[in-house]
């Protein structure tokens, strides 16, 4: 996502429409304290970053408070007074939604409905991944709201679940980030478990009458 002006690579992450993190990787300036200057409005004067990220004792990024800003971030990374990278971006194209909160499971026979608190903004996908020890890989289902029903589960099997939120690429573009996964929770016969056994337990033999 960062063009390489004078060998500077940048990364922007807009955490849950609250905080913007801009980091840079500038091999040419690896031992230099580059400064970060920004504004949210093309008409304003630039402010300098007050919350730098450091790597090996040198500036490598900036954290900005930008709660629910529907703005463009205009920024300049400078070596002294010399700009080494200047750009402007809609921050929302680099959205990383927050991890799902208040995840709940509602079981009904061979199906489970996973719900969580919807985020306050839209054009998101709520993805539930699940697997049993019998599965070689995670299965996935996603919906536009955090209300995802998965059917056809085996009530006798133990299943692990986790949930995340993704910005719709169609709307926000290709440079967003999925949220972190929620904690893994394990369920068997509609009851929560500490864990699912890594090696599947063989099915109990059916007793003939």
């Amino acid at each position: 996502q960062g063009g390489a002006a004078e060998g500077v690579q940048i990364q922007i992450i807009y955490f849950n429409l609250e905080t913007v993190q801009v980091t840079w990787n500038a091999s040419k300036y690896s031992r230099t304290n580059l400064t970060f200057h920004y504004r949210f409005n093309g008409d304003e004067a630039y402010d300098q970053c007050t919350n730098y990220l450091l790597q090996e004792g040198h500036t490598s990024g900036c954290l900005l408070d930008a709660e629910q800003r529907d703005d463009i971030l205009y920024f300049s990374i400078r070596n002294g007074t010399h700009p080494v990278f200047t750009a402007s971006r809609w921050m929302v194209y680099y959205l990383k939604p927050s991890s799902p909160k208040h995840v709940r499971f509602s079981w009904h026979q061979d199906a489970v409905t996973v719900t969580c608190s919807d985020l306050s903004y839209g054009d998101l996908l709520y993805e539930v991944q699940y697997r049993s020890p019998f599965d070689t890989e995670w299965q996935s289902k996603q919906e536009n709201t955090c209300n995802v029903t998965i059917e056809g589960l085996d009530a006798e099997k133990c299943y692990s679940f986790w949930v995340r939120v993704k910005a719709m690429e169609d709307v926000y573009g290709p440079d967003t980030y999925p949220s972190d996964w929620s904690e893994v929770t394990c369920w068997q016969r509609g009851e929560i478990r500490d864990a699912c056994a890594e090696t599947p337990t063989p099915p109990k033999p059916k007793l003939s009458k």
Epitope: D70, A87, S88, R89, W90, V92, G122, D123, D175
Partner: antibody, heavy 125, light 106 residues
Framework: QIQLGQSGPELKKPGETVKISCKAS????????MSWVKQAPGKGLQWMGW????????RYADDFKGRFAFSLETSASTAYLQIYNLKNEDTATYFC??????????????????WGQGTLVTVSA | DIVMTQSHKFMSTSVGDRVSITCKAS??????VAWYQQKPGQSPKLLIY???TRHTGVPDRFTGSGSGTDFTLTLNNVQSEDLADYFC????????FGSGTKLELK
């Protein structure tokens, strides 16, 4: 289906004021922002700015600050463009076009999928 | 403002030909580029967004490509109904349009 219907052509004298309407239907009006685009005769497209239909807050492109005003009549799902103190160079077709972003979140002016049919404003003494 | 330059004001083609319309941004815009088709007396119609995603209902003979500063709209097997003006637009920051390229018959 989603439609944006604009008011009819206007013939005005320099110094007068014009108000163009854009009535939206087929979706929840306050969910998506509305942009305005100018096209002078035989020329290209110029983004004039947009209005957040949820908050009513307008944003104007640099070339359209001063004599131009965006407004809303939310109950009628209608956006307005008003141009004051008209000049000859304001002669153009003006389009309203719906934003692709949900306005309760962000105002990123993205791709424009839905357009009004355009309103021709002619300014002539 | 970011300037979008369409260097060819006119491009001549024949039905069945392949034609490429180019657009250059004055600074890196990532893939935040759309392409529109406009016919005389009509509103612009979205063809491509995010540089290469075809909008719903747009024939697959229209293809967008590019990232950063250089973008191309390619029309394969040009049809007579494709003769129109084509505009690129960036939306990495406040939107700006290219000046347009008119596709006409040879």
């Amino acid at each position: 289906q989603i439609q944006l219907g604009q008011s009819g052509p206007e013939l005005k004298k320099p110094g007068e004021t014009v108000k163009i309407s854009c009535k939206a239907s087929g979706y929840t009006f306050t969910t998506y922002g509305m942009s305005w685009v100018k096209q002078a005769p035989g020329k290209g497209l110029q983004w004039m700015g947009w209005i957040n239909t949820y908050s009513g807050v307008p944003r104007y492109a640099d070339d359209f600050k001063g004599r131009f005003a965006f407004s809303l009549e939310t109950s009628a799902s209608t956006a307005y463009l008003q141009i004051y103190n008209l000049k000859n160079e304001d002669t153009a077709t003006y389009f309203c076009t719906r934003e692709g972003f949900i306005t309760t979140v962000v105002g990123a002016a993205g791709r424009f999928v839905y357009w009004g049919q355009g309103t021709l404003v002619t300014v002539s003494a | 403002d970011i300037v979008m330059t369409q260097s060819h004001k006119f491009m001549s083609t024949s039905v069945g030909d392949r034609v490429s319309i180019t657009c250059k941004a004055s600074q890196d815009v990532g893939t935040a580029v759309a392409w529109y088709q406009q016919k005389p007396g009509q509103s612009p119609k979205l063809l491509i967004y995010w540089a290469s995603t075809r909008h719903t209902g747009v024939p697959d003979r229209f293809t967008g490509s590019g990232s950063g500063t250089d973008f191309t709209l390619t029309l394969n097997n040009v049809q007579s109904e494709d003769l129109a003006d084509y505009f690129c637009q960036q939306y990495s920051t406040y939107p700006t349009f290219g000046s347009g390229t008119k596709l006409e018959l040879k």
